[in-house]
């Protein structure tokens, strides 16, 4: 082993890390788990502990980036340099960066979680055998409904385990259609579409209508990404394989190496290669994020490269399923930090959490999905895609309170609740509220008295939201909720009436989640809420950090603003934007300075 000159190391043992962003190659839970397991390798043999935090002052900040990504050490495209890490120290020192031009996997091909089927949401196994043939991507073979599926073991013929792959024919994400699948063909701007399209959007996201006519119904969703069949290189990088495709007059239902001398798998990205000549390489085995992270974290802890070829800290990537740490790695890290205090524990047995699956359909090799069993989309706020802009708020007749320093919104440390109402941001605190419209040099207006505008409300609010379609305003305080429609109020009602149990002490926030649906938050938990029925779906209860990794677990307010989700803790917010299947923290800032544009004096 080698350490860098001066034995650079951390001088405290409780190391913190922040996962700043994510790769789209793997489900977030798998990425979180890969990093946690990588840290666990080092904590198992030293006195070090690793705690995940959600702020940039973490010791080790983990980031995915491509090419020039904000430091002086750009990445180099696919392969070559996979990642890099800085030695221990303040600021960027100790951070670990991963090249997102790589295909990140667990070392054995793309990770595609499944839905339905009979495999409890297990990931696809590539390659797999079906009817004696090998498949390296999801397939529609054996089915008449066009739904792509995969085996979750190496051999479907012998094991019969399968699930359905992400497909717009099964579900869509975000949008305003509550996760309904695409309707093909559909009409958009008078034109017929029989596949997902990026037309009408500037951000490159693929979408579809969920009814036969978008122009009339304005219902849409985003098409799920298909990591298993998104091609690299060739002349169609980023596009999807089309199966079956014709090559030299023959039909192919899976990637092939035919016509190549190097054995690399490829596919056509249209149904006919012979006429269209559009193609790309199929995904390879990818690099194990767990193994690469374990190596980089070794650097971030102060280890240089080892000259022992079997060591984790040897400078060449080598996939292994055995224990990654070699005696040389252990000696190196213990040279810096000493051994783990006795008694020596058994090696931790960490397993990758499997995504939870919806109810399974009894299979008779692989069956069609009944419409009633189609899943709903993940409840995330829409990307910049709402087909209609938010309505503007009506003029307010509220009276302004005489001003004192504490009445300046910029002097408020922590607001009780924040909500976007109409196209303005409302900020509530101790019986008062301010209104804010984004714009150059604009300042919050107010304070106004809550009692003047909404006389039934208490002084202290926990959260507020406006349901855009009905213009209903929901105000939560403690175990009670008030619903205002214009000047008329319903309530107070107890949270039980919304289907929230006695263990829910307060509602701390809400986000839109499709047409007439919201997510309600309380501490670390969230539920889907039907605004019309004014009931939560009790089966929808979920952990906040599963759906929104990277946000603090003790947020006191969650609100939506300009189509992004904001999670507030203390004076700070964590902003989350939804991109394809990922909810990604893209900014951490101060409510006052960064949202309200208060001067930093």
């Amino acid at each position: 082993f080698q350490t860098f000159e001066g034995d650079l190391k951390w001088h405290h043992h409780n190391i913190t890390y922040w996962i700043q962003n994510y790769s789209e190659d793997l489900p977030r839970a798998v990425i979180d788990d890969a990093f946690a397991r990588a840290f666990a390798l080092w904590s198992a043999v030293t006195p070090l502990t690793f705690t995940r935090v959600y702020s940039r002052d973490a010791d080790i900040v983990i980031q995915f980036g491509v090419a020039e990504h904000g430091d002086g050490y750009p990445f180099d495209g696919k392969d070559g340099l996979l990642a890099h890490a800085f030695p221990p120290g303040p600021g960027i020192q100790g951070d670990a960066h991963f090249d997102d031009d790589e295909l990140w996997s667990l070392g054995k091909g793309v990770v595609v979680p499944t839905r339905f089927g009979n495999a409890d949401g297990a990931a696809c196994h590539f390659p797999f055998i079906f009817e004696g043939r090998s498949y390296s991507a999801c397939t529609t073979d054996g089915r008449s409904d066009g739904l792509p599926w995969c085996s979750t073991t190496a051999n479907y013929d012998t094991d019969d385990r399968f699930g359905f792959c992400p497909s717009e024919r099964l579900y869509t994400q975000d949008g305003n259609a509550d996760g309904k699948p695409c309707q093909f063909p559909f009409i958009f701007q008078g034109q017929s579409y029989s596949a997902c399209t990026t037309d009408g959007r500037s951000d490159g996201y693929r979408w579809c209508a969920t009814t036969a006519n978008y122009d009339r119904d304005k219902l849409f969703g985003f098409c799920p990404t298909r990591a298993d069949s998104t091609v690299m290189g060739g002349n169609s990088a980023g596009e999807l394989c089309v199966f079956p495709f014709t090559f030299l007059g023959k039909e192919y239902s899976t990637c092939t190496s035919e016509g190549r001398g190097d054995g690399r798998l490829w596919c056509a990205t249209t149904s006919n290669f012979d006429s269209d000549k559009k193609w790309g390489f199929c995904p390879d085995q990818g690099y194990s994020l767990f193994l690469v992270a374990a190596h980089e974290f070794g650097h971030a802890l102060g280890l240089d490269h080892s000259s022992v070829p079997e060591a984790l800290m040897y400078p060449m990537y080598r996939f292994t399923e055995g224990p990654p740490l070699h005696k040389d790695d252990v000696n190196g890290i213990r040279h810096l930090y000493g051994p783990r205090p006795e008694p020596e524990p058994r090696p931790p047995t960490t397993t990758t959490p499997q995504p939870t699956a919806p109810p399974t359909v009894c299979p008779t090799g692989p069956p069609t999905v009944h419409p009633s069993e189609r899943p709903t989309a993940g409840p995330t706020g829409p990307p910049s895609a709402g087909p209609t802009g938010p309505p503007t708020a009506g003029p307010s007749t509220a009276t302004t309170v005489p001003l004192s320093p504490v009445d300046d919104a910029c002097n408020v440390n922590i607001f009780d609740a924040i909500a976007e109402i109409g196209n303005q941001l409302y900020l509530f605190k101790d019986g008062k509220y301010w209104r804010f419209s984004e714009g150059r040099g604009s300042r919050p207006q107010g304070p106004f008295l809550i009692a003047d505008k909404w006389p039934a409300l208490p002084r202290k609010l926990d959260s507020v939201f406006e349901e855009r379609l009905s213009k209903k305003l929901f105000f939560f305080s403690g175990r009670q909720v008030w619903v205002y429609t214009g000047a008329s109020v319903l309530g107070p009602r107890r949270l039980d009436k919304l289907g929230l149990g006695a263990d829910v002490a307060q509602v701390t926030g809400a986000l839109r989640s499709g047409r007439g649906k919201m997510l309600l938050f309380s501490g670390r938990r969230l539920w889907r809420f039907d605004v019309k029925a004014q009931m939560v779906d009790p089966r929808s209860a979920s952990e906040v950090d599963r759906m929104f990794p990277g946000v603090p677990l003790d947020t006191h307010d969650v609100f939506q603003y300009r189509e992004k989700a904001y999670f507030c803790q203390d004076r700070f917010y964590w902003r989350v934007s939804s991109r394809s299947e990922l909810n990604q923290v893209d900014q951490v800032g101060y409510v006052t300075y960064d949202i309200l544009q208060c001067p930093e004096d």
């Epitope: 860098f4 020039e68 904000g70 430091d71 002086g72 050490y73 750009p74 990445f75 180099d76 495209g77 392969d79 070559g80 340099l81 996979l82 990642a83 890099h84 890490a85 800085f86 030695p87 120290g89 600021g91 960027i92 020192q93 190596h295 980089e296 650097h299 240089d304 490269h305 400078p315």
Partner: antibody, heavy 123, light 107 residues
């Protein structure tokens, strides 16, 4: 002892080509990022191009599309192929070894430099 | 690109005096700064890396300090062989850039 020895400089007409070489010895050449830095007569230092041990290449905007950096790890040699040369490319060209290598970064500085080779572009 | 500004452009001092050379970055570069010495007809020589670490074989009279945007190279007591041009170079962001140089001459 670490040594870097450049060669291949000379007088060339505008639009012409030259290939510079840098022979390295005394360290594990294949491990390190390598650089070409130039210095026009009487002027300061300017980064031209660099190459990772993995082969990833980077270029200053002023030479992009005209210069190509490469390395032959079996021969411990760094190259700079210069095409479409212009008068403003006239300079002493130095090859330099980085202190940082591979994926362990955060070490800034070029700890060894060659003696330089003069490239003159003139008609 | 990050601009590196060195000052003064020329510094005239006598042997035995203390020399203080300044380098300012147009934005924060953490501690990713190196100092080089170049004598006429020679290649640059690394003096200081990562803002404050002396390179191998560099005398103790050379020291570097600073972090963020402001950096200083100090020569505690000038020797005759120290008269040269000094360059700073950053790698806090891509691409790397050099300062325009400070000429240290005998007074």
């Amino acid at each position: 002892e670490v040594q870097l020895l450049e060669s291949g400089g000379g007088l060339v007409q505008p639009g012409g080509s030259l290939r510079l070489s840098c022979a390295a010895s005394g360290f594990t050449f294949s491990t390190y990022q390598m650089w070409w830095v130039r210095q026009a007569p009487g002027k300061g230092l300017e980064w031209v191009s660099s190459i990772y041990s993995s082969g990833g290449t980077f270029y200053a905007d002023s030479v992009k599309g005209r210069f190509t950096i490469s390395r032959d790890n079996s021969k411990n040699t760094l190259y700079l192929q210069m095409n479409s040369l212009r008068a403003e490319d006239t300079a002493v060209y130095y090859c330099a070894k980085d202190r940082a290598y591979g994926d362990y970064v955060g070490w800034n500085g070029f700890d060894y430099w060659g003696q330089g080779t003069l490239v003159t572009v003139s008609s | 690109d990050i601009q590196m500004t060195q000052s003064p452009a020329t510094l005239s001092l006598s042997p035995g005096e203390r020399a203080t050379l300044s380098c300012r970055a147009s934005q924060s570069i953490s501690s990713f700064l190196a100092w080089y010495q170049q004598k006429p007809g020679q290649a640059p020589r690394l003096l200081i890396y990562d803002a404050s670490y002396r390179a191998t074989g560099i005398p103790a009279r050379f020291s570097g300090s600073g972090s963020g945007t402001d950096f200083t190279l100090t020569i505690s007591s000038l020797e005759p062989e120290d008269y040269a041009v000094y360059y700073c170079q950053q790698r806090g962001n891509w691409p790397i850039t050099f300062g325009q140089g400070t000429r240290l001459e005998i007074k």
